[in-house]
């Protein structure tokens, strides 16, 4: 029962996480114009992985896609790749985990097969979550670097009469969505891996009994083999999988029409 609950919860958490990763990837607000300590402008700029947008105080919003591949920064391409890999792995993981769910009966699928599928989906969720966290973190790092560079530039070349204030960008909502979603997917994946241990059919412990035959003696020792749970005879020995929870490197996740003053 606890195994089913752990597996089900892991699936739901991962599902929410992957939905969040997809949402974050599609969102336009990866970076937003920094309004702190800036002259108040009637135009608000924000950027996503796929397009940049401008919202005027009039309410008119214009978004322009990045219609070039070669002209984009390598870091942005890397972030896109990480997020897409995360989504693809997560989607496959979800597909696999649906069939692995203990509460769903599909033909005569053995528990060992479900255990393997649960483990596979768990690993996929973990990698998917890590990809999302890595992608968002790379973008955040890029923003921080650019922020301080533009801050330094702000105070240079202002000797003349004309002031040109550079637009600085700070963390957008998508970054927080991505971090949280990546974390949830990671947690869901770990839960699936934990559930995998309990899903593997329990071994039957036989007491050591010595049978004395006329010619030679064979001693049967307890443990070591899994009891068969299929129909008909199953003479193959199934290797016990020790689904111990692997320790991952802990990754910390940090958490209108108009804006008025």
């Amino acid at each position: 029962m606890a195994v089913t609950a752990c597996q089900g919860l892991g699936f739901v958490v991962s599902l929410i996480g992957i939905a969040g990763i997809i949402a974050a990837t599609c969102m336009d607000q990866w970076s937003t114009q920094d309004l702190y300590n800036n002259p108040v402008t009637a135009v608000f700029n924000y950027q996503g992985l796929w397009r940049s947008c401008v919202r005027e105080s009039s309410g008119f919003t214009e978004c322009r896609g990045y219609f070039t591949l070669l002209g984009l920064p390598a870091m942005l391409q890397a972030v896109r790749a990480l997020m897409i890999v995360g989504i693809v792995l997560g989607a496959i993981g979800l597909l696999v985990s649906i069939f692995a769910l203990k509460c769903i009966r599909i033909g005569s699928m053995e528990d060992s097969a479900k255990a393997n599928m649960t483990l596979t989906s768990g690993i996929m969720f973990i990698v998917s979550g890590l990809c999302a966290i890595a992608g968002v973190s790379v973008f955040a790092n890029m923003l921080v670097t650019n922020f301080w560079m533009s801050t330094a530039n702000m105070y240079t070349g202002m000797g003349g009469m004309v002031q040109t204030v550079q637009t600085r960008y700070t963390f957008g909502a998508a970054l927080f969505v991505g971090w949280v979603a990546g974390g949830l997917t990671l947690i869901g994946g770990v839960m699936m891996c934990i559930a995998c241990r309990g899903l593997a059919p329990e071994e039957t412990n036989y007491k050591a009994v010595s049978y004395h035959a006329s010619g030679h003696s064979v001693a049967y020792k307890p443990g070591g083999f899994k009891a068969s749970t299929g129909f008909g005879s199953n003479t193959k020995n199934k290797k016990i999988y020790d689904g111990g929870a692997r320790t991952e490197d802990e990754v910390q996740s940090y958490p209108s029409k108009h804006d008025y003053v």
Partner: antibody, heavy 118, light 113 residues
Framework: QAYLQQSGAELVRSGASVKMSCRAS????????MHWVKQTPGQGLEWIGY????????YYNQKFKGKATLTADTSSSTAYMQISSLTSEDSAVYFC???????????WGQGTLVTVSA | DVVMTQSPSSLTEKTGEKVSMSCKSS????????????LTWYQQKPGQPPKLLIY???TRESGVPDRFTGSGSGTDFTLTISSLQTEDLAVYYC?????????FGAGTKLELK
């Protein structure tokens, strides 16, 4: 076609207050900012501020903070501007205007002439 | 505040002539996000409210004759009337629509020679 109808001319005593109106028609009143502009022969055109009738949010030119108060009544699609503690410097034509692309002002009221007497 | 400086303050020309007037801002009105200049040109005739001619420095408002052209970027802008008509006699104002508070130029009065 959008249209902004402003209230008539006002002759008011120094130190008093005046409240003028701007009735909007031909568009969704709650979807656009309503700006107010002051025009005097000496100072030219001066932007006072705007109100977003959708939520009542306002943004004022620092120069007019405390002097002008912008309000809106969505039920009658009317924007109001009250000017308090009137002095001779407040004698001017006041326009209401609806914003557009580029934060420009596309539709203007005909103007309300305010004359402050001693 | 952004100071808008218009020149000349008045301009006298004959009908059919090409007319240009300048508007300079103390700060850049170019938004890096969309590469648009938030400068607007208005025409005002006596006893009337201003009329929108050009927004985003160069985009002509619908219904405005194509003899009116806006140009410039950053801090220097120009309004050009390719062939002056009698109905163009008015005061022309430029406006900063980028930084609060929105500010207007003092205007250029266009008169007939």
């Amino acid at each position: 076609q959008a249209y902004l109808q402003q209230s008539g001319a006002e002759l008011v005593r120094s130190g008093a207050s005046v409240k003028m109106s701007c009735r909007a028609s031909g568009y969704t009143f709650t979807s656009h900012n309503m700006h107010w502009v002051k025009q005097t022969p000496g100072q030219g055109l001066e932007w006072i501020g705007y109100i977003y009738p959708g939520n009542g949010g306002t943004y004022y030119n620092q120069k007019f903070k405390g002097k002008a108060t912008l309000t809106a009544d969505t039920s009658s699609s009317t924007a109001y501007m009250q000017i308090s503690s009137l002095t001779s410097e407040d004698s001017a034509v006041y326009f209401c205007a609806r914003d557009y692309y580029g934060n420009s002002f596309v539709y203007w009221g005909q103007g309300t002439l305010v004359t402050v007497s001693a | 505040d952004v100071v808008m400086t218009q020149s000349p303050s008045s301009l006298t020309e004959k009908t059919g002539e090409k007319v240009s007037m300048s508007c300079k801002s103390s700060q850049s009105l170019l938004n890096s996000g969309n590469q648009k200049n938030y400068l607007t040109w208005y025409q005002q005739k006596p006893g009337q409210p201003p009329k929108l001619l050009i927004y985003w420095a160069s985009t002509r408002e619908s219904g405005v004759p194509d003899r009116f052209t806006g140009s410039g970027s950053g801090t220097d802008f120009t309004l050009t009337i390719s062939s002056l008509q009698t109905e163009d006699l008015a005061v022309y104002y430029c406006q900063n629509n980028y930084r609060y508070p929105f500010t207007f130029g003092a205007g250029t009065k266009l008169e007939l020679k």
